[in-house]
Interface confidence: low
């Protein structure tokens, strides 16, 4: 048999809180336990579900959990079934609701001296107790013509008067908790002795020296009083006015007129109405003085034809907000079309050249008007006034290539030489009108030149070839002074270039003809065997038909070229001894000898006491030291010729003689015999 060890029992439960209906069974075989609510099987949900044999409630819900629960145990093998005792919840709850008018049926029917009943729609179980409030203040029974019972949900005002006007709310509490009205009720019972607003003053904005009018009206029975105050609570009347409101007038209907408004009149004006009974009504309005600031400047604008562009006008700060409009040629722009105003923007659609000009943004309010001009340029593609022409430019002279164009705005011109941009330097200069100047034309300037003229609307370009007209010149110019070696063959070249290949000939400066052993072969003067008489002044003459002739003068000297009679040798000297480096040279003119030691010329006037250069050219160094070691170069030179020869100098320590060495033992290497420099010890 199936036996219930624990049966569910009826119990108190709180709305929205946890609960558990217990059920435990004992049976010989396996049993299946399920629950019924009002005879229908209970399905598990997240809120309500079987927990073992018991039924668990995560949050009791008044509508869903009201009814009779029963636990059923069934043996599916034998078919035996047992049911528990019935159990139900006593659910405690409270739910907020509005304050509503119960009597009379509508607000329109509320009159002074009628009975008014309000109901508090807060419900709960157990039945809550109620508390009423007017304007947040609790109401108690028997006070000021109203009936209220904490057990009753109604508030009765009998009779209702103006003193009952206000915002009514209610709260209720029970064992479960507390709730207050979700919507309150405003009771308005007019008292004709209270001041009521008929006309409220509005904020005004006026220009300096203009007039301002504030309207203000109240009604009451008997008629209410009306008073105006300004800012610092100073009353304004026609009899006594503060000094800065000398031009104020209060009319019988309550309106306040201010004439010739000044800055000090700006501020808050208060209109106060007071009935025979009730609180004063204070209405405020502000007088603003109109103002308008300056407008920012526009940058000039450049647009291209066919494009759409916009120019925004930033309105100046001002009160009231300034209105903004655009004008062109004294005419206000429309709000649609090809050139029109949209908001604060000037819009130019499909721009035409004729749209160029000055456009003016205007801003205005009561305080005045501001304007700012914007200059609009419509860019055009440049057109040619003068293209660059193929040109012949003379070498060595300035050359000019024109690139004259016109456009709006003024076009910028750049030049290219062999497709490379020409940057202005000492040789090239681009003038404001686009002309290129080559300061000193050179042969290699003969090439292609291209100029490009541009505006934002587009660019044009043209090219021209430059041919350089070479000047007649020696290439290279002959050296003005040249030497020839006596008794040897010699040549003196002279070559020149020009627009036409020039003819070149040599002559002696004195006009005498060249001897037969001297030939002039296409500009090269050839001496078969130089004699002393060949010395002298010669002139090379280059000439052609178109350019005439040019001359170069050359002084030829006949010389015996330098040869060394004696050359310095590799020399090794003991430290402290004297080194002699010999050098003798011959030639005509007689050569001069200079020495170079360790990469610097030895100046005979600054040699110091240890060094000396003899008349014949030999160099002597006394009391040699290791730092004198190095390469020494003998340089022989005259007006025609220069030759050099070099040898190293080694300075070594003198070895100390050993016992085994005899007095005649040779040094370990060959020494140049020099004189020992004796030191005298005092």
């Amino acid at each position: 048999a199936i036996v219930f060890i624990k049966q569910p029992s009826s119990q108190d439960a709180l709305q929205g809180r946890r609960a558990l209906l217990r059920c435990e069974v004992e049976a010989p075989g396996p049993v299946h336990v399920y629950w019924l609510l009002d005879g229908a099987p209970v399905q598990d949900t997240e809120r309500r579900f079987a927990q073992g044999s018991s039924l668990s409630f995560a949050a009791v819900d008044r509508p869903q959990d009201s009814g009779t629960f029963q636990c059923v145990a069934r043996d599916d093998v034998t078919g035996e079934e047992a049911r528990s005792a019935n159990a139900s919840f006593n659910i405690k709850w409270i739910e907020a609701g509005p304050v509503v008018l119960k009597h009379p049926a509508s607000e329109a029917e509320i009159q002074p001296q009628t009975q008014v009943t309000l109901r508090c729609h807060i419900d709960g179980h157990p039945r809550p107790t109620y508390q009423w409030f007017r304007d947040g203040t609790p109401l108690s029974d028997g006070q000021s013509n109203h009936t209220v019972s904490s057990k009753e949900r109604n508030l009765t005002l009998r009779p209702a008067g103006p003193e009952h006007s206000g915002l009514y709310s209610c709260c209720a509490h029970s064992a479960f908790g507390q709730a207050c009205s979700s919507q309150n009720f405003t009771l308005s019972i007019a008292d004709e002795s209270f001041a009521r607003v008929v006309l409220a003053p509005q904020d005004v904005v006026v220009a300096r020296y203009e007039e301002a009018m504030f309207h203000c009206q109240f009604s009451a029975q008997p008629p209410p009083s009306l008073q105006w105050l300004f800012e610092d609570e100073t009353p304004i009347t026609n009899r006594s006015r503060p000094p800065h409101l000398r031009r104020a007038t209060v009319f019988a209907n309550g309106s306040l007129l201010l004439t010739q408004v000044r800055p000090r009149n700006a501020g808050i004006y208060r209109c106060i109405g007071q009935g025979q009974r009730g609180p004063p009504i204070i209405l405020e309005a502000t007088l603003h003085l109109a103002e308008i600031e300056d407008m920012p400047l526009f940058e000039p604008r450049v647009f291209t034809a066919g494009s759409e562009e916009r120019v925004t006008c930033l309105p100046p700060k001002g009160l009231p907000e300034p209105s903004v409009w655009w004008e062109h040629a004294g005419v206000r722009l429309p709000t649609h079309g090809r050139v029109y105003q949209k908001g604060h923007e000037l819009v130019l659609a499909n721009i035409a050249e004729s749209d160029a000009g000055v456009y003016t943004c205007h801003a205005a309010n009561l305080a005045g008007q501001r304007r700012q001009d914007v200059n609009i340029t419509v860019a055009t593609v440049p057109s040619w006034l003068k293209k660059p022409q193929d040109s012949q430019l003379e070498e060595g002279k300035p050359g000019y290539l024109d690139c004259l164009t016109q456009a709006t705005p003024k076009p910028t011109v750049v030049w290219y030489r062999n497709q490379m941009l020409i940057s202005e330097d000492s040789r090239f200069e681009v003038f404001k009108n686009g002309t290129l100047r080559i300061n000193s034309v050179e042969v290699y300037d003969g090439t292609w030149y291209r100029c490009m003229s541009s505006t934002p609307a587009g660019s044009i370009e043209a090219q021209a070839r430059v041919q350089v007209l070479e000047k007649l010149k020696f290439t290279p110019p002959p050296q003005p002074q040249q030497c020839m070696e006596f008794d040897k063959e010699a040549t003196v070249p002279c070559s020149a270039t020009g627009r036409e290949k020039p003819t070149i000939k040599w002559e002696r400066a004195d006009g005498s003809s060249l001897p037969e052993w001297v030939t002039d072969n296409a500009g090269t003067l050839h001496f078969a065997r130089v004699t002393r008489d060949d010395a002298g002044n010669y002139t090379c003459i280059a000439s052609n038909g178109p350019q005439g002739q040019i001359r170069a003068h050359v002084q030829l000297t006949v010389a015996v070229f330098i040869t060394f009679k004696v050359e310095p040798e590799r020399t090794t000297v003991y430290q402290g001894h004297t080194a002699l480096l010999q050098c003798e040279a011959q030639g005509d003119p007689k050569p001069l000898i200079q020495w170079k030691g360790k990469d610097r010329i030895l100046d005979p006037t600054k040699l110091g006491p240890r060094m000396h250069i003899f008349q014949n050219g030999s160099l002597v160094i006394h009391d040699v030291a290791p730092e004198d070691s190095g390469r020494y170069t003998c340089i022989a030179g005259n007006s025609c010729n220069i030759k050099h020869t070099e040898a190293p100098l080694y300075v070594v320590d003198k070895p100390v003689p050993e016992e085994s060495e005899g007095p005649g033992s040779p040094p370990p290497y060959k020494m140049i015999q020099t004189h020992h420099h004796h030191h005298h010890h005092h």
Epitope: R208, H244, P263, L289, A290, I292, E293, D294, A367, G368
Partner: antibody, heavy 120, light 107 residues
Framework: QVTLKESGPGILKPSQTLSLTCSFS??????????VGWIRQPSGKGLEWLAH???????YYNPSLKSQLTISKDTSRNQVFLKITSVDTEDTATYYC????????????WGQGTLVTVSA | DIKMTQSPSSMYASLGERVTITCKAS??????LNWFQQKPGKSPKTLIY???RLLDGVPSRFSGSGSGQDYSLTISSLDYEDMGIYYC?????????FGAGTKLELK
């Protein structure tokens, strides 16, 4: 841009009349809300307001000097004038011309000032 | 006449320091008060108009505040360029009146 420049006699003797001219550019006294005034500053001392004239010829004077002061304008020539009669050594000061824009910044623009010395 | 009392009459401050100069009117002048800066041998320059509005081009380290009778000029972080004499001006009523000035020098 807005510029104002004062000009005056430099030196004058007590009891003479001081005539000052303010020449301005960058705005017009025919524009509503524009005004020009005069302020002076004795060397090493503070600033003293003298007079003001508005675009509509409304004029205001410092009451302490009112009987000596006359302010006027020539709108077409962009000039404002100030006359001070019966000057004394105490009127030695730098005189500044200033622009006001009613409902915007009063004295936003100042001239460089002109030094007037009253000496016997 | 409205009397403007400026304080302090002179002060020393260090670079980067926050500096405040005050001006008290003998009656309510709100909001009609300007602040000026004057450097030796130069014309005064307007910094602030209508109590708290910065004139175009004036560095944002300058600010003005106040209402009724009490007004102040504040330099949030003193710069070498800010040395000079500062004046306040009321333009609520004619005659217009200036404060006596505050000389600001480098400490």
């Amino acid at each position: 841009q807005v510029t104002l420049k004062e000009s005056g006699p430099g030196i004058l003797k007590p009891s003479q009349t001081l005539s000052l001219t303010c020449s301005f550019s960058g705005f017009s006294l025919s524009t509503s809300n524009m005004g020009v005034g005069w302020i002076r500053q004795p060397s090493g001392k503070g600033l003293e307001w003298l007079a003001h004239i508005w675009w509509d010829d409304d004029k205001y004077y410092n009451p302490s000097l009112k009987s000596q002061l006359t302010i006027s304008k020539d709108t077409s020539r962009n000039q404002v004038f100030l006359k001070i009669t019966s000057v004394d050594t105490e009127d030695t000061a730098t005189y500044y011309c200033v622009r006001s824009n009613y409902g915007y910044a009063w004295f936003a623009y100042w001239g460089q000032g002109t030094l007037v010395t009253v000496s016997a | 006449d409205i009397k403007m009392t400026q304080s302090p009459s002179s002060m020393y401050a260090s670079l980067g320091e926050r500096v405040t100069i005050t001006c008290k009117a003998s009656q309510d002048i709100y909001p009609y008060l300007n602040w000026f800066q004057q450097k030796p041998g130069k014309s005064p320059k307007t910094l602030i108009y209508r109590t708290n509005r910065l004139l175009d081009g004036v560095p944002s380290r300058f600010s003005g505040s106040g209402s009724g009778q009490d007004y102040s000029l504040t330099i949030s972080s003193l710069d070498y360029e800010d040395m000079g004499i500062y004046y306040c001006l009321q333009y609520d009523e004619f005659p217009l009146t200036f404060g006596a000035g505050t000389k600001l020098e480098l400490k």
